[in-house]
């Protein structure tokens, strides 16, 4: 028979013959012949491959550096690599999770929208006509000012986006 | 065709070195591991070590130190340090890792003072 | 350093009979089932038979049948003929820094 040119899904063609590749797991040790299929080894510990392969060496897990600010979220397997996440309070700086920065903190006169995770920063927001935030926080909310009216007050201040209004007593008529 | 020939076989005397070369043709060394193999005259197969696809080499514990395996792009070479009489035997080459499916027809050492 | 021990030898059969030759590991083979079984006849290389303990090489007449799993492996050669005649080898793949090794070889003789 002809030898093929191209071979199946899951193959490679090498001398004139289509070999398996390895399973994801597994690296190739020797190529198959006309006698046997092809050869392959699982991964060493901490080592893995995710694709149907012919490499010939396994690649590392990613390692989580605590000195990055880095913790294991997901352990690595013969067919996956490590997933690394940020420790509280911070997150990656990009989506390949190599390295942490501390979660942003929302300056007076602005409000938490979305709180960080390990993966994305804190989203900011100006706090609007009626709100406030004194204080810089990655956690804390524009809080709407305080309602003199439902407290029998009346505003002897008014309100800002870094500062709450001031209630006072209304002023009694005289006769 | 995928094929294998042992050469450098011959008589020596204690203690002289000895290259064994493995000559291969129809594959490739640098995806293929290739292990040596040796049978003295009535005796059983017996493994000495082999040659990864990187160029790392593995032996048995009772060959290590003796004999040193190398390869170049379509040889595999057994080298053996210091014969002695017991190293007395036909030097066989095969292809693969843990599988070897393809053997040469084997060279034959003679240590003899 | 691992041990293979094969059982019986010699050992002798008739024509159309059925030989079974056991091969024990002192310690568990690579993934488990890193054994292959090869045939020698005088004067010849060995010829791969079955490997990864049970998987017909290609060529092989399928009254050659390996078994087993771990240390302990087997290997049946039913309906035997004249040509079976030869020395049966078993021979395992280790992790890697222990290698390979060989059980010392079976002779069978067909009567």
């Known amino acids: 028979p002809e030898p093929p040119t191209a071979c199946r899904e899951k193959q490679y063609l090498i001398n004139s013959q289509c070999c398996s590749l390895c399973q994801p797991g597994q690296k190739l040790v020797s190529d198959c012949t006309e006698f046997t299929e092809t050869e392959c080894l699982p991964c060493g510990e901490s080592e893995f491959l995710d694709t149907w392969n012919r490499e010939t060496h396994c690649h590392q897990h990613k390692y989580c550096d605590p000195n990055l600010g880095l913790r294991v979220q997901q352990k690595g397997t013969s067919e996956t690599d490590t997933i690394c996440t940020c420790e509280e309070g911070w997150h990656c700086t990009s989506e390949a999770c190599e390295s942490c920065v501390l979660h942003r903190s929302c300056s007076p006169g602005f409000g938490v929208k979305q709180i960080a995770t390990g993966v994305s920063d804190t989203i900011c927001e100006p706090c609007p006509v009626g709100f406030f935030s004194n204080v810089s926080s990655a956690f804390e909310k524009c809080h709407p000012w305080t309602s003199c009216e439902t407290k029998d007050l009346v505003v002897q201040q008014a309100g800002t986006n870094k500062t709450d209004v001031v209630c006072g007593p209304q002023d009694r008529l005289r006769a | 065709c995928q094929s294998l020939e042992e050469s450098g076989g011959r008589l020596v005397t204690p203690g002289t070195p000895l290259t064994l070369t493995c000559t291969v043709s129809g594959f490739d060394l640098s995806s293929n591991a290739m292990n040596w193999v040796r049978q003295a005259p009535g005796k059983g197969l017996e493994w000495i070590g082999y040659i990864t696809i990187s160029g790392s080499a593995g032996y048995a514990s009772w060959a290590k130190g003796r004999f040193t395996i190398s390869k170049t792009s379509t040889t595999v070479d057994l080298k053996i340090s210091s014969p002695t009489t017991e190293d007395t035997a036909t030097y066989f080459c095969?292809?693969?890792?843990?599988?070897?499916?393809?053997w040469g027809p084997g060279t034959l050492v003679t240590v003899s003072s | 350093a691992q041990v293979l021990t094969q059982t019986p030898s010699p050992v002798s059969a008739p024509v159309g009979g059925t030989v079974t030759i056991n091969c024990q590991s002192s310690?568990?083979?690579?993934?488990?089932?890193?054994l292959a079984w090869y045939q020698q006849k005088p004067g010849q290389p060995p010829k791969l038979l079955i490997y990864d303990a049970s998987k017909l090489a290609s060529g092989v007449p399928s009254r050659f049948k390996g078994s087993g799993s771990g240390t302990q492996f087997t290997l049946t050669i039913s309906g035997v003929q004249c040509d079976d005649a030869a020395t049966y080898y078993c021979q395992a793949g280790y992790s890697s820094g222990d290698g390979n090794a060989f059980g010392g070889g079976t002779e069978v003789v067909v009567k």
């Open positions: 095969a292809r693969g890792y843990n599988t070897m499916a393809i």
């Open positions: 310690q568990n083979v690579l993934i488990n089932n890193r």
